[in-house]
């Protein structure tokens, strides 16, 4: 079967403070079974930005409809961006298990925050 690829097409995104940032992520396979999660940063200090189990994540919305069947678009929008949001965001596929285990990561999208226009 087709090997899963996680495509984050934007290497970087620049957003003015107070605006919304869209972080794109698509996958090429429904396998392995398991969830997608978004993180800022890598390693043990990474911060969970979105998954569908925990939360709420009041500033994060999914771009695709939540009732879309066989969804392969896991892009998110983060509202009211502040300088604290700057960093590299990773879209990561987990393999279902007890607990779920990280399977593959996208290449990451670096979010930079511009000063709010006066």
């Amino acid at each position: 079967e087709e090997e899963l690829q996680i495509i984050q097409p934007d290497k970087s995104v620049s957003v003015a403070a107070g605006e919304s940032a869209i972080l794109h992520c698509t996958i090429t396979s429904l396998f392995p079974v398991g969830p997608i999660q978004w993180f800022r940063g890598a390693g043990p200090a990474r911060v969970l930005i979105y998954n569908q189990r925990q939360g709420p994540f009041p500033r994060v919305t999914t771009v695709s409809e939540t009732t879309k069947r066989e969804n392969m678009d896991f892009s998110i929008s983060i509202s009211n961006i502040t300088p604290a949001d700057a960093g590299t965001y990773y879209c990561i596929k987990f393999r279902k298990g007890s607990p779920d285990t990280e399977f593959k990561s996208g290449a990451g999208t670096e979010l930079s925050v511009r000063a709010k226009p006066s």
């Epitope: 079967e1 392995p32 079974v33 569908q52 409809e65 069947r69 066989e70 393999r95």
Partner: antibody, heavy 120, light 108 residues
Framework: DVQLVESGGGVVRPGESLRLSCAAS????????MSWVRQAPGEGLEWVST??????YYADSVKGRFTISRDNSKNTLYLQMNSLRAEDTAVYYC???????????????WGLGTLVTVSS | EIVLTQSPATLSVSPGERVTFSCRAS??????IAWYQQKPGQAPRLLIY???SRDTGIPDRFSGSGSGTDFTLTISSLQSEDFGVYYC??????????FGGGTKVEIK
């Protein structure tokens, strides 16, 4: 049209083995997770097992005794059932999984089922 | 394991009546609930997924609602072909996928 056709059911004694098959057509079999769900006579539905690509999941009641597998070249799902018990007596349904949004799976197409009877 | 409790176990209804089925989860399952119809001697048929989305080809007299722990399936005007058993299923936390015990709809 999606079609799922189970076969391989029958009457066996406790401790014996049986292998169920499910022939799938009308969709791209290899890209979907597939499951087995059973229904004991006069009872409700009980999930048995699910397979993704090579990832497999089992109900506690069958773990270590049943093995789910698939042959994508033949569009066929299998359930190898060993050490069968009287409580495994049921109609076994093959079901195609569907995912929605960012969440888990439900079953959007079902076969007609095959009856497995375990009796001494 | 998430337990789904369906009530009532049996409903006696006349054609044309409005019918409501309840499914209660032992813990929060968000909107990750599907509903199935099973007629005697037949396989289950998907009616509703994501708590309220009708599957392709399902008549609009069927509707689902709820989130969290309490879910409802409603048939606005029962037709003769709607008799059978209705099951809810959660897919929020698995394995295992779990089903409710079912609600049987019979002719009054």
């Amino acid at each position: 049209d999606v079609q799922l056709v189970e076969s391989g059911g029958g009457v066996v004694r406790p401790g014996e083995s049986l292998r169920l098959s499910c022939a799938a057509s009308g969709f791209s079999f290899s890209i979907y997770a597939m499951s087995w769900v059973r229904q004991a006579p006069g009872e409700g539905l009980e999930w048995v097992s699910t397979i993704g690509a090579d990832d497999t999941y089992y109900a506690d009641s069958v773990k270590g005794r049943f093995t789910i597998s698939r042959d994508n070249s033949k569009n066929t799902l299998y359930l190898q059932m060993n050490s069968l018990r009287a409580e495994d007596t049921a109609v076994y349904y093959c079901a195609k999984d569907s995912t929605v949004g960012w969440s888990g799976d439900f079953f959007d197409y079902w076969g007609l089922g095959t009856l497995v009877t375990v009796s001494s | 394991e998430i337990v789904l409790t369906q009530s009532p176990a049996t409903l006696s209804v006349s054609p044309g009546e409005r019918v409501t089925f309840s499914c209660r989860a032992s813990q929060n399952v968000r909107s990750d609930i599907a509903w199935y119809q099973q007629k005697p001697g037949q396989a289950p048929r998907l009616l509703i997924y994501a708590a309220s989305s009708r599957d392709t080809g399902i008549p609009d007299r069927f509707s689902g609602s709820g989130s969290g722990t309490d879910f409802t399936l409603t048939i606005s005007s029962l037709q003769s072909e709607d008799f059978g058993v209705y099951y809810c299923q959660q897919y929020y936390d698995w394995p295992p996928f779990t089903f409710g015990g079912g609600t049987k709809v019979e002719i009054k």
